[in-house]
């Protein structure tokens, strides 16, 4: 069955830095989206071989592409705190196929201690389990950010 391999699972970067997200499939795509999950999922880019990519205005001028729609690397530049979130690749094929998601944590330098990625992929709730029918629902919920450690009481 068609599937999307997506990497990395999670990445922590300082404000102003760049991040690469790679979406790989076995081919046979019409095109591929990168979408930011949340209460209202938002398209970030749509890429189709031989067609000028479409990019959300929030990221215009901050995104580069390399490869082809079957093996696409998306580079997001000049990251802002508001870019923090879970991004998923979605392949347009006969049925909907989703990547596992990439949690991007954009941090201010001093807070990187607790804004850290674990080795685990984004939590499973970020992508719904497919129903018994052939069409998958739109992914709805984003992975939550890790909770900051509880402040220790002052002496």
């Amino acid at each position: 069955a068609q599937e999307v391999q997506q990497s990395p699972h999670c990445t922590t970067v300082p404000v102003g830095a760049s991040v690469n997200i790679t979406c790989s499939t076995s081919g046979g795509l019409r095109g591929i989206y990168l979408r930011q999950l949340g209460p209202q999922p938002q398209d970030i880019i749509y890429y189709e071989d031989g067609v000028v990519p479409t990019t959300d205005r929030r990221f215009r001028g901050r995104i580069d592409f390399s490869g082809s729609q079957d093996n696409l690397t998306i580079t997001m530049h000049r990251l802002q705190l508001s870019d923090t979130g879970t991004y998923t690749c979605q392949a347009i094929t006969e049925v909907n196929v989703y990547g596992s998601g990439t949690l991007v944590l954009v941090t201010e330098e001093q807070s990187q201690g607790w804004h850290r990625c674990s080795d685990a992929p984004p939590r499973a709730s970020a992508l719904p389990a497919p129903p018994t029918g052939s069409a998958l629902p739109d992914p709805q919920t984003a992975s939550a950010l890790p909770d900051p450690p509880a402040a220790s009481a002052l002496p």
Epitope: G31, R35, Q40, D43, T54, N96, A135, L136, D138
Partner: nanobody, 122 residues
């Protein structure tokens, strides 16, 4: 140029079936929710069925529930309306409609097909 080409209409007897198709070109089909509307002579255009852009959900006007089925193929840029147990009151011009919802890169854009006539009569 953007095009939605509706086809599949015709004359059918009550109780019969018909399948409509709408082939899209000139825009990114998967970025749009797709709907079928119908307009009977002298009446306003009414929504019949809608399917979300990735096919996750569909909705139907009460009078067609259980008889009509909307589906889409994003790999072929086509939306379908399968109509069963047709009644004379289903007679109308049927139009397909594309509308980009919130969250889509093309939010706010919408397009209409030229329509295909369905006549249910004995």
């Amino acid at each position: 140029a953007v095009q939605l080409v509706d086809s599949g209409g015709g004359l059918v007897q009550p109780g019969g079936s018909l399948g409509l198709s709408c082939a899209a070109s000139g825009f990114t089909f998967s970025g749009f929710d797709m709907s079928w509307y119908r307009q009977a002579p002298g009446k306003e255009r009414m929504l019949v069925a809608t399917i979300t852009r990735f096919g996750g959900s569909s909705n139907y006007e009460d009078s067609v529930k259980g008889r009509f089925t909307i589906s889409r193929d994003n790999a072929r840029d086509t939306v379908y309306l399968q109509m069963n147990s047709l009644k004379p009151e289903d007679t109308a011009m049927y139009y397909c409609h594309a509308e980009a919802p919130a969250g889509s890169l093309w939010f706010g854009n919408n397009y209409w097909g030229q329509g295909t006539q369905v006549t249910v009569s004995s």
